[in-house]
């Protein structure tokens, strides 16, 4: 018995179905086919779980969280024992193993391994200003999304006036900050943060209004 090489890893957007491939070749009939799918979740690597089981011509549910969401892609028994997972969740991310036994065919590689990563688009980021908005001050524009896998990158742009960040601005695309030194009246305006990753983007807006010093009456 020989389980074929798997593609290594699969990526899927949260909520979308995933197909985890596993095919094998055997010299024996499929009368005594036994297939166990296991997962080692990324969130709990020392707690493997059973996903689905085929034994004695019957299918059995695995861990409760997979109930109603998992099944074999084809009619069993078959040499294609790939499974689907519907409505994928973040907790489904992990390393999946298909263990195949088909007596009396023993020997060879009977395990296939596939990684599954459930991707999450960035949630609506939160924009805020840190620092004084008085003319001549330094300000930091902050942007962060609570959710996002892979981790989002953050890009700031100016939506009005000259449509560009001033030369004194420095961006940190990982932290989601833009630091603007020595702000002037021209720094005022609407700024947009674009949080993006492999499967989506999300934005927030921020209105920076630079405060000019008020002339003081002397008397």
């Amino acid at each position: 018995l020989e389980v074929s090489e798997s593609p290594g890893s699969i990526q899927v957007a949260r909520g979308q179905p995933a197909v985890l491939p596993c095919t094998f070749t055997t010299s024996a009939a499929l009368i005594n086919l036994n297939v166990i799918w296991m997962v080692t979740p990324l969130s709990n690597a020392n707690q493997p779980e059973q996903v689905i089981l085929y034994q004695g011509g019957q299918m059995f549910d695995g861990a409760p969280r997979f109930h109603g969401r998992v099944g074999f892609t084809g009619t069993m028994p078959a040499t294609n024992v790939s499974i689907f997972i519907n409505n994928t969740q973040l907790s489904d991310t992990g390393t999946y193993q298909c263990l195949v036994n088909n007596l009396p065919d023993i020997g060879g590689r009977n395990i296939g391994v596939t990684g599954l990563t459930v991707l999450v688009p960035p949630s609506a980021p939160h924009c805020q200003i840190q620092g004084s908005q008085d003319i001549g001050s330094d300000v930091i524009l902050l942007c962060s999304s609570e959710e996002g896998i892979p981790r989002p990158t953050y890009l700031w742009e100016k939506l009005d006036n000259t449509l560009k960040l001033p030369p004194t601005a420095t961006q940190d695309q990982v932290q989601g900050t833009v630091t603007i030194r020595n702000i002037s009246a021209l720094s005022s305006g609407l700024y947009q943060c674009v949080a993006s990753n492999a499967i989506g983007t999300s934005t927030c807006l921020l209105d920076l209004q630079v405060i000019s010093p008020q002339p003081r009456n002397i008397g």
């Epitope: 890009l155 009005d160 006036n161 449509l163 560009k164 021209l186 947009q192 674009v194 934005t203």
Partner: antibody
Framework: EVQLLESGGGLVQPGGSLRLSCAAS????????LSWVRQAPGKGLEWVSA????????LYADSVKGRFTISRDNSKNTLYLQMNSLRAEDTAVYYC??????????????WGQGTMVTVSS | ASVLTQPPSVSAAPGQKVTISCSGS????????VSWYQQLPGTAPKLLIY???KRPSGIPDRFSGSKSGTSATLGITGLQAEDEADYYC???????????FGGGTKLTVL
């Protein structure tokens, strides 16, 4: 080589449409705001439209507002100008221009060679 | 007509100095930066001055810029035959949320 290369110009009838493209190379496209500038035969420069780094912000000259649409595709390093309801007075050489990151104000530090748009019946 | 006013033409002899003015208002030049461009016949414009008085690398120091109130000025010293071109000022106008060029000035080197 750092350059901008416009294409898509040609002869079009009044009321017609045209889409100009500007392909950028040699620099990080998404780090610059960009503009379209035109020049009618024998006339001066006229700014047409501008767009921010990721396209969230756009500006238009009053003469083209509601008829022209500026857009960009950062994955293709390309700037576009969709021109609808064209008029004879839109006849001009159209340049794409890059706004300098070193300047506080507007400063076009890189220009394309231009593409000619002729609106005539 | 442009909201930025430039003289249609200026002329001077080689080696001389020439200035080109760009007049606007508080809603454009008065509260914003000015840039200047040179356009040789049949070619695309070239940036000469940005942020009122800064020169990009490669622009000779014969070219200078200044701003006072609602007017900007481009100065060219040691005039050369190859300086014969059209010159344009550019700024941003807060009132209309647009960029605006001056009408252009044709420089003739006598």
């Amino acid at each position: 080589e750092v350059q901008l290369l416009e294409s898509g110009g040609g002869l079009v009838q009044p009321g017609g449409s045209l889409r100009l493209s500007c392909a950028a190379s040699g620099f990080t496209f998404s780090k610059y705001s960009l503009s379209w500038v035109r020049q009618a035969p024998g006339k001066g420069l006229e700014w047409v439209s501008a767009i921010s780094y990721y396209g969230g912000g756009t500006l238009y000259a009053d003469s083209v507002k509601g008829r022209f649409t500026i857009s960009r595709d950062n994955s293709k390093n390309t700037l576009y100008l969709q021109m609808n309801s064209l008029r004879a007075e839109d006849t001009a050489v159209y340049y794409c221009a890059r706004d300098s990151r070193d300047a506080y104000g507007v400063a076009f530090d890189l220009w394309g060679q231009g593409t000619m748009v002729t609106v005539s019946s | 007509a442009s909201v930025l006013t430039q003289p249609p033409s200026v002329s001077a002899a080689p080696g001389q100095k020439v200035t080109i003015s760009c007049s606007g208002s508080s809603s454009n030049i008065g509260n914003n930066y000015v840039s200047w461009y040179q356009q040789l016949p049949g070619t695309a414009p070239k940036l000469l001055i940005y942020d009122n008085n800064k020169r990009p690398s490669g622009i000779p120091d014969r070219f200078s810029g200044s701003k006072s109130g609602t007017s900007a000025t481009l100065g060219i010293t040691g005039l050369q035959a190859e300086d014969e071109a059209d010159y344009y000022c550019l700024t941003w106008t807060g009132a209309g949320r647009i960029f605006v060029f001056g009408g252009g000035t044709k420089l003739t080197v006598l």
